[in-house]
């Protein structure tokens, strides 16, 4: 296992709709052709999976018909955008990133951006 | 370093809109957000509200909605706070602080807004 | 909203004394709590960052505690320069708030 630089923004804010995106960088140090994203978030020193998926250089991301997040890729940069975001959910997410094939395989951990995600204001009743 | 440097003090007329900038140096602006927080003569901190200069969505504090404006220039690594309609109890010393994963870190040197009729 | 009150308001101490300074959230905030420094007339400046790390540069007598609500930021061996006012801030859930604060003055 070799180690990779993978560079992602320190804070986001998400919008009042619940969505967050961001990019996650890596420094490929060769041609990979197969990668493994994988988004964890840390909260009070607990660390969960978000989401993942695995994609073909050159090709869309896929994450399971029910996550949270999709995302995008070009080159060695991959937008991700996690959505149904609410308060509690406010956290460190950290991108992982995989190199799978060729071999060797290469692990790329960010340092996390801080997702901060404020509940929006309930709408008044309105009388009709 | 980390560098926050904000406009000189103003003095407002109640009613005359305030704009404080606030030049970022030091670090990559966009990975950051700014907050603004103002304290008032012999005060407190208290916090008003801040901007992601990553996506410029902002989350001001209740008492300031529809009266503050929070936007940054990404060309030129500056935050901006404008209070519209000011009264003399907006006076106070306005500070903008880089927000990163650990709440506020850095902090500029203020700016002394007063307003007076 | 959090809530953060802090105790005592004011506290004269006498240089090499201990200084303790209690932070109190409304609410469990984890360890999302941050400790600042103020100085007449200058910006706040951070101390601690997630309730006991401390921020780069800052002298090894000032230590913090503490998780859920109830935090503490000592001063060993307090100096003259420490004369200041100390600020406690939640950084768990927007909007973000500070404490009331802390004057410490010197004897």
């Known amino acids: 296992c070799k180690a990779m630089h993978v560079a992602q923004p320190a804070v986001v804010l998400a919008s009042s709709r619940g969505i967050a995106s961001f990019v996650c960088e890596y420094a490929s140090p060769g041609k990979a052709t197969e990668v493994r994203v994988t988004v964890l978030r840390q909260a009070d020193s607990q660390v969960t999976e978000v989401c993942a998926a695995t994609y073909m250089m050159g090709n869309e991301l896929t994450f399971l018909d029910d996550s949270i997040c999709t995302g995008t890729s070009s080159g060695n940069q991959v937008n991700l955008t996690i959505q149904g975001l609410r308060a509690m959910d406010t956290g460190l997410y950290i991108c992982k990133v995989e190199l799978m094939y060729p071999p060797p395989y290469y692990l790329g951990i960010g340092n996390g951006t801080q997702i901060y995600v404020i509940d929006p204001e309930p709408c008044p009743d309105s009388d009709f | 370093q980390v560098q926050l440097v904000q406009s000189g003090p103003e003095v407002k007329k109640p009613g005359a809109s305030v704009k404080v900038s606030c030049k970022a140096s030091g670090y990559t602006f966009t990975s950051y957000g700014i907050g603004w927080v103002r304290q008032a003569p012999g005060q407190g901190l208290e916090w008003m509200g801040w901007?992601?200069?990553?996506?410029?969505?902002?989350n001001y504090v209740q008492k300031f909605q529809g009266r503050v404006t929070m936007t940054t220039d990404t060309s030129t690594n500056t935050a901006y706070m404008e209070l519209r309609s000011p009264r003399s109890d907006d006076t106070a010393v306005y500070y903008c602080?880089?927000?990163?994963?650990?709440?506020?870190?850095?902090w500029g040197q203020g700016t002394l807004v007063t307003v007076s009729s | 909203e959090i809530v953060l009150t802090q105790s005592p308001d004011f506290q004269s101490v006498t240089p090499k004394e201990k200084v303790t300074i209690t932070c109190r959230a409304s609410?469990?905030?984890?360890?999302?709590l941050h400790w600042y420094q103020q100085k007449p007339d200058q910006s706040p400046k951070l101390l601690i960052k997630?309730?006991?790390q401390s921020f780069s540069g800052v002298p090894s007598r000032f230590s913090g505690s503490g998780s859920g609500t109830d935090f503490t930021l000592t001063i060993n061996s307090l100096e003259a320069e420490d004369a200041a006012t100390y600020y406690c801030h939640q950084s768990s859930s927007l909007p973000f708030t500070f404490g009331p604060g802390t004057k410490v003055d010197i004897k």
């Open positions: 997630y309730a006991s």
């Open positions: 901007i992601s200069a990553y996506n410029g969505n902002t």
């Open positions: 609410q469990s905030i984890g360890s999302s």
């Open positions: 602080a880089r927000v990163g994963s650990s709440g506020v870190d850095y």
